[in-house]
C-alpha cells in the first residue's frame, strides 16, 4: 500500500524540484527510514530552538557573504539527528568554520526529504493537527488546496490554510534565487578578471 | 534589487471604490506569494490579504471579505487590490510585501476613507 | 484566529545595554515540522516595516548580528544584545502558521 504513495511522491517531487543536480541527488537512493515511518516528524535543524537558558547568546559566526538564501543552505543539518537534541544556532554548521556543511544540492534533497516523510506518516483523523499538516505537505507538493477562495462560496467557514509548507518552499526559491545571483556575481567578477 | 512600489491611494468617500496597485522588479515575480499588509494612522499592523504563485488561491482577513478583491498580473509583475464599499475603518497606509515572511516592503500608499 | 501579545509595550533603553522584547501566541506555533513560523520585524519611524528574524530564530539578510530571536510554541523573545541609537522603533511580531496571519500590537524601543 505504501508503495504506489511513495512512487508517486517521488514523481512528484521530481517533477517539482527546481534544478537538475537536486533532481539527481534525490534519484540516488531511498528515503532513510522511509519503509518505517519515523513515530513524530523529523525537524530541521535549521529551525530547531536554541536552548532555554538565561545565559547571552554567542553571536554566530558568519561568512561574510552570507545572505539569507545561503544562511538557508549552509545552516540544514543532519536530518538523521534526534529531535531531542537539537543544535542551537550558536553550535550549527556555521559556527564550525570549515565543518563539513551540507552542499546547495544536498540541502535541497533534504528539504524534500523532510516532506516526504511527512507524506509517508500513518494516516490520522480528518482534523487533527498532523492531519491538516500532512495535508499541507501534499498542497506544498503540487497537490490540491483544501479551501481556495473559487470554494469559499459554501456557508461553512473553510479551516484556516497551514502556511508553514507554503512558506518552507518559499525559503527554498529565496536560496535558490540567492545563490543563481551569487553565481552570476561570481562569473562576472571572472569575465573582469579574463578581460584585464 | 528587489523594489516594490504601490500606487493608487487617494482620498475616498465612504461606499466608494479604489484600485491600489504594487510594481516588482528585481525578483522572479511569479515565484512568490505576494501580501497586503495596512496600517491605521498611529496603529499596528494588519493583514489583509495575500495570493498564491500562480493566483490560484487568495485569502483575506474578515474584515474585508467579500469587500476586497486581491489579484495578479505575473506577465506584468504587478500586484492589485480592488477596494469595494469603502468604510473610514479601511483608512490605512497599504504596503505590499514579497512572500510569506514579508522579507521586502514597500514604500506604502496612503488611502482616505472620509465624507 | 490566533493572537500576539507582546511585552512591555514600551521599552526604555539606554545605548549599549541589552533589550529584550517578549511575545506570546495564544496557540502554539511548533508546526509538526518543528518550525516555529514566527517572525520579527522592526519599523523605524517614518519608514515601512523590515524583516529582522525569519521562523523564530534566523537573522534575515543584511540584519547586524546584535539581533537574536528565540523561542519555541507559544513563547518567543528578541534580544538585541547592545542597544544602537538606530534601533530605535516599533518591534513586531507575526505568526505565518496559518490564515490570518497575525501581528503583535508592537513594543516601541526608546532611547532613554
Known amino acids: 500500500m505504501r508503495l504506489p504513495l511513495l512512487v508517486s511522491a517521488g514523481v512528484l517531487l521530481v517533477a517539482l524540484l527546481p534544478c537538475p543536480p537536486c533532481r539527481a541527488l534525490l534519484s540516488r537512493g531511498p528515503v532513510p527510514g522511509a519503509r518505517q515511518a519515523p513515530q513524530h516528524p523529523q525537524p530541521l535543524d535549521f529551525f530547531q530552538p536554541p536552548p532555554q537558558s538565561e545565559q547571552p547568546q554567542q553571536p554566530q559566526a558568519r561568512p561574510v557573504l552570507l545572505r539569507m538564501g545561503e544562511e538557508y543552505f549552509l545552516r540544514l543539518g543532519n536530518l538523521n539527528k534526534s529531535p531531542a537534541a537539537p543544535l542551537s544556532p550558536a553550535s550549527s554548521l556555521l559556527a564550525g568554520g570549515s565543518g563539513s556543511r551540507p552542499s546547495p544540492e544536498q540541502a535541497t534533497a533534504n528539504f524534500f526529504r523532510v516532506l516526504l516523510q511527512q507524506l509517508l506518516l500513518p494516516r490520522r483523523s480528518l482534523d487533527s493537527p498532523a492531519a491538516l499538516a500532512e495535508r499541507g505537505a501534499r498542497n506544498a507538493l503540487g497537490g490540491h488546496q483544501e479551501a481556495p477562495e473559487r470554494e469559499r462560496r459554501s456557508e461553512e467557514p473553510p479551516i484556516s490554510l497551514d502556511l508553514t509548507f507554503h512558506l518552507l518552499r518559499e525559503v527554498l526559491e529565496m536560496a535558490r534565487a540567492e545563490q543563481l545571483a551569487q553565481q552570476a556575481h561570481s562569473n562576472r567578477k571572472l569575465m573582469e578578471i579574463i578581460g584585464k | 534589487e528587489v523594489q516594490l512600489v504601490e500606487s493608487g491611494g487617494v482620498l475616498v468617500q465612504p461606499g466608494g471604490s479604489l484600485r491600489l496597485s504594487c510594481a516588482a522588479s528585481g525578483f522572479t515575480f511569479s515565484s512568490y506569494w505576494m501580501t497586503w499588509v495596512r496600517q491605521a494612522p498611529g496603529k499596528g499592523l494588519e493583514w489583509v490579504a495575500n495570493i498564491k504563485q500562480e493566483g490560484s488561491e487568495k485569502y483575506y482577513v474578515d474584515s474585508v471579505k467579500g469587500r476586497f478583491t486581491i489579484s495578479r498580473d505575473n506577465a506584468k509583475n504587478s500586484l492589485f487590490l480592488q477596494m469595494n464599499s469603502l468604510r473610514a475603518e479601511d483608512t490605512a497606509v497599504y504596503y505590499c510585501?514579497?512572500?510569506?515572511?514579508?522579507?521586502?516592503w514597500g514604500q506604502g500608499t496612503l488611502v482616505t476613507v472620509s465624507s | 484566529d490566533i493572537v500576539m501579545t507582546q511585552s512591555p509595550l514600551s521599552l526604555p533603553v539606554t545605548p549599549g545595554e541589552p533589550a529584550s522584547i517578549s511575545c506570546r501566541s495564544s496557540?502554539?506555533?511548533?508546526?509538526?515540522?518543528?518550525?516555529?513560523?514566527l517572525e520579527w520585524y522592526l519599523q523605524k519611524p517614518g519608514q515601512s516595516p523590515q524583516l529582522l528574524i525569519y521562523l523564530g530564530s534566523n537573522r534575515a539578510s543584511g540584519v547586524p548580528d546584535r539581533f537574536s530571536g528565540s523561542g519555541s510554541g507559544t513563547d518567543f523573545t528578541l534580544k538585541i544584545s547592545r542597544v544602537e541609537a538606530e534601533d530605535v522603533g516599533i518591534y513586531y511580531c507575526m505568526q505565518t502558521l496559518q490564515t490570518p496571519i497575525t501581528f503583535g500590537q508592537g513594543t516601541r524601543l526608546e532611547i532613554k
Open positions: 496557540q502554539s506555533l511548533l508546526h509538526s515540522t518543528g518550525y516555529n513560523p
Open positions: 510585501a514579497r512572500t510569506l515572511i514579508f522579507d521586502y
